[in-house]
């Protein structure tokens, strides 16, 4: 129960964050124009990884696409790169995962197989998570470096009087939100991979033992007790839910060891 | 067709206060923002204070104190509160309408005249 | 403030003549983010409103007869009427339409020589 129930939320959590890693690298809102200590202009600049936007006091908003591949600098190109790699390991590990849900029964697979699959889809969203956190930190980076280097030259003199205001920007509310969505996939990948370790079927020693009465091919197993003998290695741990009679075929199913209450 | 209104001009004494009216027709206040500019007899033109679309004001800073920008959206009208009326607010106050893009005053109205006086 | 300064302050122009009006601003008025200049022109007519007839710096307002032309771009800016009629005599203004308060220059008044 504890770990379908750590699958299921370690799947909403990913979905959350993967959702958000979408969100944030659609969003305009990676830079925005820094209001802090400048002069009260009638437009506000903001930009995002594949567009700039104006936005004026009239309610008028312009964006303008960054119709250039070569032209662009070369970490904003890295980070769309790794919020796009973000994006589509998340989408697979999402696919993924979605089939290795205990609570979801496809055919006969195995809990060996949706194990592999918890395990596989839990790196993916690891991955996922950290290509977003890193995208969002290398363009912030970028941002504050920018940031000091205009501050610097903030007012460039022109003939004594004249000034250029230059535009400083500073962190998009896209930044928090990849930031919390790469967290959030993070955490739903660990709690994947965490739930792997429960779903996967252990080796025992313990096996059904069968008690052949003389003269009867019945197996009586007492409820409730795990006998065992050092034969049948295919056997598995299994719960008996009545003291009743069984056949020696049905020794050799195959539950999982969390069917114990 | 775009028309701008303004009423409420007169003579009044110095430190007294005086509401003045713009009615908008043509266009909605909720989609233009609205200005009112003075201009002082025989000198040029001074911006005194917006009213956006969504209800943002800007104000002159030197007259900020004293002046009140608002709007009635279900009335169509702009008004401009003045307070503490000095001779040197004695002027032709005009209300224009944004034009949205590129922030300019397209439609202006014909204007009222205040004059500050004892 | 943003001082915005005109220059003449009077220009006298022979009927069809280009007539050139400059205006300068203390701060750049060019916003990086569209390269766009945030600059209008007005015309002035004794006893009348102000009528818009350049924005953006360069933009002509719908119904403006296209001998007024507008130039320039960060701080300095040019109004040129390419052939001055006499219906042109009036009071021209420049105005910064970017940093708050939206201010205008003191004004040119054009005249016929």
């Known amino acids: 129960m504890a770990v379908t129930a750590c699958q299921g939320l370690g799947f909403v959590v990913s979905l959350i964050g993967i959702a958000g890693i979408i969100a944030a690298t659609c969003m305009d809102q990676w830079s925005t124009q820094d209001l802090y200590n400048n002069p009260v202009t009638a437009v506000f600049n903001y930009q995002g990884l594949w567009r700039s936007c104006v936005r004026e006091s009239s309610g008028f908003t312009e964006c303008r696409g960054y119709f250039t591949l070569l032209g662009l600098p070369a970490m904003l190109q890295a980070v769309r790169a790794l919020m796009i790699v973000g994006i589509v390991l998340g989408a697979i590990g999402l696919l993924v995962s979605i089939f290795a849900l205990k609570c979801i029964r496809i055919g006969s697979m195995e809990d060996s197989a949706k194990a592999n699959m918890t395990l596989t889809s839990g790196i993916m969203f690891i991955v996922s998570g950290l290509c977003a956190i890193a995208g969002v930190s290398v363009f912030a980076n970028m941002l504050v470096t920018n940031f000091w280097m205009s501050t610097a030259n903030m007012y460039t003199g022109m003939g004594g009087m004249v000034q250029t205001v230059q535009t400083r920007y500073t962190f998009g509310a896209a930044l928090f939100v990849g930031w919390v969505a790469g967290g959030l996939t993070l955490i739903g990948g660990v709690m994947m991979c965490i739930a792997c370790r429960g779903l996967a079927p252990e080796e025992t020693n313990y096996k059904a033992v069968s008690y052949h009465a003389s003269g009867h091919s019945v197996a009586y197993k007492p409820g409730g007790f795990k006998a065992s003998t050092g034969f049948g290695s295919n056997t598995k741990n299994k719960k008996i839910y009545d003291g009743g009679a069984r056949t020696e075929d049905e020794v050799q199913s195959y539950p999982s060891k969390h069917d114990y209450v | 067709q775009v028309q701008l209104v303004e009423s409420g001009g007169g003579v009044v004494q110095p430190g007294r206060s005086l509401r003045l009216s713009c009615a908008a027709s043509g266009f909605t206040l909720t989609s233009y923002g609205v200005y009112w500019v003075r201009q002082a007899p025989g000198k040029g033109l001074e911006w005194v204070a917006v009213v956006w679309a969504g209800g943002n004001t800007n104000y002159n800073s030197a007259l900020m104190s004293r002046f009140t920008i608002s709007k009635d959206n279900s009335k169509s009208t702009l008004y401009l509160q003045m307070n503490s009326l000095r001779a040197e607010d004695t002027a032709v106050y005009y209300c224009?309408?944004?034009?949205?893009?590129?922030?300019?005053?397209?439609?202006w109205g014909q204007g009222t005249l205040v004059t500050v006086s004892s | 403030d943003i001082v915005m300064t005109q220059s003449p302050d009077s220009l006298a122009v022979s009927l069809g003549e280009r007539a050139t009006i400059n205006c300068k601003s203390s701060q750049s008025l060019l916003n990086s983010g569209n390269q766009k200049n945030y600059l209008a022109w007005y015309q002035q007519k004794p006893g009348q409103p102000p009528k818009l007839l350049i924005y953006?710096?360069?933009t002509r307002e719908s119904g403006v007869p296209d001998r007024f032309s507008g130039s320039g771009s960060g701080t300095d800016f040019t109004l040129t009427i390419s052939s001055l009629q006499a219906e042109d005599v009036a009071v021209y203004y420049c105005q910064n339409d970017y940093f708050f308060p939206f201010t205008f220059g003191q004004g040119t008044k054009v005249e016929i020589k």
């Open positions: 224009a309408r944004d034009r949205g893009r590129l922030l300019a005053m397209d439609y």
């Open positions: 953006g710096a360069s």
